[in-house]
Structure formats: structure tokens, C-alpha cells
């Protein structure tokens, strides 16, 4: 769920998600529309697709709580719990490391970006 994602992103990136990523650009945070603004925004768009796929699989993406271990900078998704819990962890792990990989191109001006400015084709999944 959201608590898992917030904790994981903070551990991996060192940034407080609520201050740095939710929202950011056109896809980080709730919802998403238009062309992603930068690599960080692309991470979130891909994560949205990951969640959309799990939703089509009947997973409760905001409610399911999963277990994982964070050690020496790495995330290990537990094989405990249901299939949905395990896949949700995999989606969140991917976005966390994607955000970390793109910290060097993070743009403060895209924090709280005005969503009506998010134009263009929304990328397909």
C-alpha cells in the first residue's frame, strides 16, 4: 500500500516522498496525464502502468500491505503473503530505484507542477 511505497522510496532515495515526489511533474502522485516531463516523471508513469496491470489482475493496490527487507541499500521483496502482495512490492521496488537513478536530473520546479499544463499524448502502458 501507500505506506509501503512511502517508506521504500525514502529508504532508497533518501528523500521524503511527501515533500519531493507526491506530487511531481505530470505523473508522480495521484493520477497522471500527458507526456512525462523528465526521467523522474517517467519513473512514476511506468509505476502507474505497473499498478494498472495489478488492478486488472484484481489486486487491491492501495490496501494490500506487503513485507520487505531493506539492507545495505537493497530491497528484498518477501515471498510471504499473496501473489498480489509480492507483485505490489516488485512495482514499488522498481519505482524506488528508478527515482534513485534519476536523482541527478531532479528538478525542483516540477514539484507541485500545475497539472493543467500536462499536455500531449499520455504514454500507453
Amino acid at each position: 500500500g501507500i505506506l509501503n511505497l512511502n517508506k521504500m522510496v525514502k529508504q532508497v532515495t533518501g528523500k521524503m516522498p511527501i515533500l519531493s515526489y507526491w506530487p511531481y511533474g505530470c505523473h508522480c502522485g495521484l493520477g497522471g496525464r500527458g507526456q512525462p516531463k523528465d526521467a523522474t516523471d517517467w519513473c512514476c508513469q511506468t509505476h502507474d502502468c505497473c499498478y494498472d496491470h495489478l488492478k486488472t489482475q484484481g489486486c487491491s493496490i492501495y490496501k494490500d500491505y506487503y513485507r520487505y527487507n531493506f539492507s545495505q541499500g537493497n530491497i528484498h521483496c518477501s515471498d510471504k503473503g499473496s501473489w498480489c502482495e509480492q507483485q505490489l512490492c516488485a512495482c514499488d521496488k522498481e519505482v524506488a530505484f528508478c527515482l534513485k537513478r534519476n536523482l541527478d536530473t531532479y528538478q525542483k520546479r516540477l514539484r507541485f507542477y500545475w497539472r493543467p499544463h500536462c499536455r500531449g499524448q499520455t504514454p500507453g502502458c
Epitope: D64, K80, W83
Partner: antibody, heavy 121, light 106 residues
Framework: QVTLKESGPGILQSSQTLSLTCSFS??????????VSWIRQPSGKGLEWLAH???????RYNPSLKSRLTISKDTSRNQVFLKITSVDTADTATYYC?????????????WGQGTLVTVSA | QIVLTQSPAIMSASPGEKVTISCSAS?????MYWYQQKPGSSPKPWIY???NLASGVPARFSGSGSGTSYSLTISSMEAEDAATYYC?????????FGAGTKLELK
């Protein structure tokens, strides 16, 4: 060789607390990834999953019974326990403990013989 | 929770006959698991991750399906196959079982 064996009171009165023990051999609950579930089956009816405990003491419960269930373990004695509070006649069933397979952690590969529990009004 | 509906509830088959037991999920699941149970015995693992046979299961058994529709098939019924078969999912919590299909020898 993996074996599990359940034990319980046999008969108890409505409103009492049911205490069950699963004694096992052939594996250790201190091994990473290991876990044991409790599953019950009323006579002539289907299976109902109740609870699961993992090697690291993480516990999962069936939401429909969660308020009445407590699962625990004694790793050194190779035992898993289940307590069900405020039982009534609907809790009459054969209770099984089961362990998932190494190769597929959602498949219960090993089952105990079951212990019949009868709740009288 | 995901409800698994098995059909038929009871069926009978003659030796050599092809048998198909169905398991329908109330919402999509990734895998299905099957168990065989005979009277007075504990359930035995039969099929895992939809189509893989558990150890010791005869090759005449097979499993298939996806989404909300899964099935267990016996290519040629034998006397020892008479039993109750249960499907199970752990796609999402809680883990649930179907009500069972009782297969009798005709």
C-alpha cells in the same frame, strides 16, 4: 521426512477457548521462508484456511475470524499453536496443520492427519 | 475475498471416461492450486501453479486455465481417482478454497 500431527481437546463446551497444538518434524521453523498454517474442515464440508505463522513470527489471519484467533509457535520444541476464543457449535470440525512446499509457497504439500474437535451446546 | 465456485458439486464417471472439473473465481487470479481428498484422509497436493503436477500424481491428470476460469482434467478415469477435489487460490488475501467436487466411480 516431513510430518505434522495435531492435538486438541476433542470435546469442549460452547463459549470456551479452543487450544490446538501442531507438533512437527523434518523441518525447522527457524529456517527462512518456512511457515505453518491451520486449516479446518467441518464434517462433510469444504476446507477453510484460518491462520499462518512464518519463521520470523509474522502472522496472517482469515479476516472473518481474526478477532477470535491467535497463532503462535515454539521454535525450539517444533510446535505451532492455535487458540480460538468463544467457540460455538459452528466451530465443530477437523482441524489440520499444514506446511507449504519448498517449490511453491502457496501449495500445502504436507498435512497432518487432523484432529476432530466437537463443540457442544 | 475471492470466492471459488466449483462445478459440478458431485459427478460420476466410468472407467476410461474423460473428466473435467471446473473452478470459477469471483475475480481474476494468477494461479490455481488443486488438492485430492479421500474419505478419512487429509487432503493431498495435486496440482500447483495451475498446470504443474505434484509429486506422485499420475500423468492422466492435467490442469489449465487463466483469469477467472480454471479446470482439472483426467484424460481417462480410473477407480483410484474417485475422491473429492478442491481448488485453492492465494492471489489475494485471504487464501480461499472451493467447496469441492466429489468424483464418484460409475
Amino acid at each position: 521426512q516431513v510430518t505434522l500431527k495435531e492435538s486438541g481437546p476433542g470435546i469442549l463446551q460452547s463459549s470456551q477457548t479452543l487450544s490446538l497444538t501442531c507438533s512437527f518434524s523434518g523441518f525447522s521453523l527457524s529456517t527462512s521462508g518456512m511457515g505453518v498454517s491451520w486449516i479446518r474442515q467441518p464434517s462433510g464440508k469444504g476446507l477453510e484456511w484460518l491462520a499462518h505463522i512464518y519463521w520470523d513470527d509474522d502472522k496472517r489471519y482469515n479476516p472473518s475470524l481474526k478477532s477470535r484467533l491467535t497463532i503462535s509457535k515454539d521454535t525450539s520444541r517444533n510446535q505451532v499453536f492455535l487458540k480460538i476464543t468463544s467457540v460455538d457449535t459452528a466451530d465443530t470440525a477437523t482441524y489440520y496443520c499444514a506446511r507449504p512446499a519448498y517449490y511453491s509457497n502457496h501449495l500445502f504439500a504436507y498435512w497432518g492427519q487432523g484432529t476432530l474437535v466437537t463443540v457442544s451446546a | 475475498q475471492i470466492v471459488l465456485t466449483q462445478s459440478p458439486a458431485i459427478m460420476s464417471a466410468s472407467p476410461g471416461e474423460k473428466v473435467t472439473i471446473s473452478c470459477s473465481a469471483s475475480s481474476s487470479v494468477s494461479y490455481m492450486y488443486w488438492y485430492q481428498q479421500k474419505p478419512g484422509s487429509s487432503p493431498k497436493p495435486w496440482i500447483y501453479r495451475t498446470s504443474n503436477l505434484a509429486s506422485g500424481v499420475p500423468a492422466r491428470f492435467s490442469g489449465s486455465g487463466s483469469g477467472t476460469s480454471y479446470s482439472l482434467t483426467i484424460s481417462s478415469m480410473e477407480a483410484e481417482d474417485a475422491a473429492t477435489y478442491y481448488c485453492q487460490q492465494y492471489h489475494s488475501s485471504p487464501l480461499t478454497f472451493g467447496a469441492g467436487t466429489k468424483l464418484e466411480l460409475k
